[in-house]
Amino acid sequence: HTAAQDNCTCPTNKMTVCSPDGPGGRCQCRALGSGMAVDCSTLTSKCLLLKARMSAPKNARTLVRPSEHALVDNDGLYDPDCDPEGRFKARQCNQTSVCWCVNSVGVRRTDKGDLSLRCDELVRTHHILIDLRHRPTAGAFNHSDLDAELRRLFRERYRLHPKFVAAVHYEQPTIQIELRQNTSQKAAGDVDIGDAAYYFERDIKGESLFQGRGGLDLRVRGEPLQVERTLIYYLDEIPPKFSMKRLTA
């Protein structure tokens, strides 16, 4: 569904301003911060969401080992530059003219430089590893049940096609969800794994981006699945370029 016509809100993004000023008086929603029109029938891009967040008031064994090229978002929040489609621009700079290159999920993939830094292309993050630790339960979850419910969650809540959920690993209390999506696999209209992972991350933190929906309440055969910590690793189609100084720090 598009923006809800009756009360003109955006079901998939509460960080919007909506008004019935679209064609034929239809409800149209614009992201805070950028003012860009968003499609409320799908997830909003992470770049627009980060920009909106920065503009908002501040109060408002079988397990996979991440590869040596995996990135973790250690830099935290920044006010990104987004292209007209809402994607991250390959080069990001702050107010003090410090610049760096980012991948398609907006995570820095080079050392920081000055305005002369070149970022030739936006490198795609094609593999995301979401590493969760759940709170203690009476017993371990059944792996097959867990797989079924997490797939359902990504399919139903984030509209991510099941083929992009590559695997769900479980070794109590650690759950790992692998999302994979190459450039060639992503068709028009497909939700991006980076956007799905970001919505999931915010849901897990109790900061749902959905309008009016309750927070994430995930249960497996009636047993609540409560997450106590999350780590997300990002793997790019082209390995990141950091100096040895950073790697040995």
Epitope: D147, A167, R221, G222
Partner: antibody
Framework: QVQLQESGPGLVKPSQTLKLTCTVS?????????WNWIRQPPGKGLEWIGY???????LYNPSLKSRVTISRDTSKNQFSLKLSSVTAADTAVYYC??????????WGQGTLVTVSS | DIQMTQSPSSLSASVGDRVTITCRAS??????????LHWYQQKPGKAPKLLIY???NLESGVPSRFSGKGSGTDFTLTISSLQPEDFATYYC?????????FGQGTKLEIK
């Protein structure tokens, strides 16, 4: 033992709204699982209509989405189906069923709804 | 939508026969640890009854003469030795993608 029981009118006029209720006993619908409606036209196969989850989230079959609403009343441990603008093609046996982890382990006995003037 | 195709559409067999019904999905319904394919039995005037879930798991209370196997797109339901109460219509169902979809059914009749 979990039991599901459908109830509602057996005859609905074309263009009207079909309303059915499923009463669940032996399990609280807000404690877990997904609570579904499935239908079967006479002599034909099964068609999934949609569900409401333990937390109140909905998912509908896109082929019926514009006409379907599934809601719940947790105080009565019931969930309901509304199907608007019905035609003769909506004549079917309507089942409610529990979806455990994406398969249906408990079913109601079904109720036949005929759409006719 | 994922299309589920069962074969044969109908089948005549005798008590004691071994019978196999096939279900083919238009795309894979398997994950790394799951096969989202389930089998149901339906008798006239009754609700479907779950027989096998996730391709090969026998539902509690279902006789061991029923078995299922397969992965990806191709699945089978086998009844090792038909009993009189087994004459019914059988449906497969996928739950890898929404909307959930069922096969058209296989009617098992007495020869």
């Amino acid at each position: 033992q979990v039991q599901l029981q459908e109830s509602g009118p057996g005859l609905v006029k074309p263009s009207q709204t079909l309303k059915l209720t499923c009463t669940v006993s032996g399990y609280s619908i807000s404690s877990g699982y997904y609570w579904n409606w499935i239908r079967q036209p006479p002599g034909k196969g099964l068609e999934w209509i949609g569900y409401i989850s333990y937390s109140g989230r909905n998912l509908y079959n896109p082929s019926l989405k514009s006409r379907v609403t599934i809601s719940r009343d947790t105080s009565k441990n019931q969930f309901s189906l509304k199907l608007s603008s019905v035609t003769a093609a909506d004549t079917a046996v309507y089942y409610c069923a529990r979806d455990t982890t994406a398969y249906f382990d408990y079913w109601g006995q079904g109720t036949l709804v005929t759409v006719s003037s | 939508d994922i299309q589920m195709t069962q074969s044969p559409s109908s089948l005549s067999a005798s008590v004691g026969d071994r019978v196999t019904i096939t279900c083919r999905a238009s795309e894979s319904v398997s994950s790394s640890v799951n096969r989202f394919l389930h089998w149901y039995q339906q008798k006239p005037g009754k609700a479907p009854k779950l027989l096998i879930y996730r391709a090969s798991n026998l539902e509690s209370g279902v006789p061991s003469r029923f078995s299922g196997k397969g992965s990806g797109t191709d699945f089978t339901l086998t009844i090792s030795s038909l009993q009189p109460e087994d004459f019914a219509t059988y449906y497969c169902q996928q739950s890898n993608e929404d909307p959930y979809t069922f096969g058209q059914g296989t009617k098992l009749e007495i020869k």
